[in-house]
């Protein structure tokens, strides 16, 4: 059995109250695909949400978060409070990163500093609450007599290609 409603275009619905003719979606509703028997209610961006894209007859509204918050979840289903760099959000609010950890963003958790010694390197720049450590050359590379400079490339005579 063929669906009589399958050809009603997006932005409309197949109106059973009017002998299954296509009717436009009412205000504040939409249908993003054809053949719909009802239109969906538009999402409303209220409170900590702000409107990024208005609802139309064929597409839902899209929300962002107001200043001081950031989106979480698919299609920005939740807004989470921003913290400062060097902090993470806990149940009790924004807390500074513990020593040995950092967060360089306004969201997410504090992560441990890189352990340079695991790669046989030394700490070039110490870490902070906001920044990871910067690893430098290995201690062996810096021992007396070790040259960190690369030898110059041999000069080529003009008109000769290398062997």
């Amino acid at each position: 059995l063929q669906d009589l409603c399958s050809n009603c275009p997006a932005g409309t619905f197949c109106d059973n109250n009017r002998s299954q003719i296509c009717s436009p979606c009412p205000p504040n509703s939409f249908s993003s695909a054809g053949g719909q028997r009802t239109c969906d209610i538009c999402r409303q961006c209220k409170g900590v949400f702000k409107t990024r894209k208005e609802c139309s007859s064929t597409s839902n509204a899209e929300c962002d978060c107001i200043s001081g918050y950031h989106c979480l979840g698919a299609e920005c289903s939740m807004c989470e409070q921003d913290c400062k760099q060097g902090q993470e959000l806990t149940k009790k609010g924004c807390k500074d990163c513990c020593f040995g950890t950092f967060n360089d963003q306004k969201r997410g958790i504090c992560r441990p500093w890189t352990n340079c010694s695991l790669d046989g390197k030394s700490v070039l720049v110490n870490g902070t609450k906001e920044r990871d450590v910067v690893c430098g050359p290995s201690p062996a590379d810096l021992s007396p007599g070790a040259s960190s400079a690369t030898p110059p490339a041999p000069a080529r005579e003009p008109g000769h290609s290398p062997q």
Epitope: C5, N7, P9, I21, P24
Partner: nanobody, 121 residues
């Protein structure tokens, strides 16, 4: 309330032409398919032509190449241009609002009252 009002019928000689109009109101015309049907004396009502909102058209084999269906969404009107008319085209012609914007295996939701077309020498 859906209203469909046909006009343009009349008497014409074989080989002649007529243009039928169907003025629609009471619904969103531009998103719905419209069709023309006819009923000859003593016969069942039969499909003639249909046009969907996207202007795809379908015709009965008996009228292909002779009849043309068109629509003007600004005027909420559907037309049937009939040429090379034959005696067997004599019938009452009805405008129909089709369910679900469908022109394939169409089903009529609302009918007009019809307009008579007579083809005779």
């Amino acid at each position: 309330e859906v209203q469909l009002l046909e006009s343009g019928g009349g008497e014409v000689q074989p080989g002649g032409s007529l243009r039928l109009s169907c003025a629609a109101s009471g619904f969103s015309f531009s998103i719905n398919a419209m069709g023309w049907y006819r009923q000859a004396p003593g016969k069942r009502r039969e499909f003639v032509a249909a046009i969907e909102s996207g202007r795809n058209t379908v015709y009965a084999e008996s009228v292909k190449g002779r009849f043309t269906i068109s629509r003007d969404n600004a005027k909420n009107t559907v037309y049937l241009q009939m040429s090379s008319l034959r005696a067997e085209d004599t019938a009452v012609y009805y405008c129909g609002l089709l369910k679900g914007n469908r022109v394939v295996s169409p089903s009529v939701a609302y009918w007009g009252q019809g307009t008579l077309v007579t083809v005779k020498p």
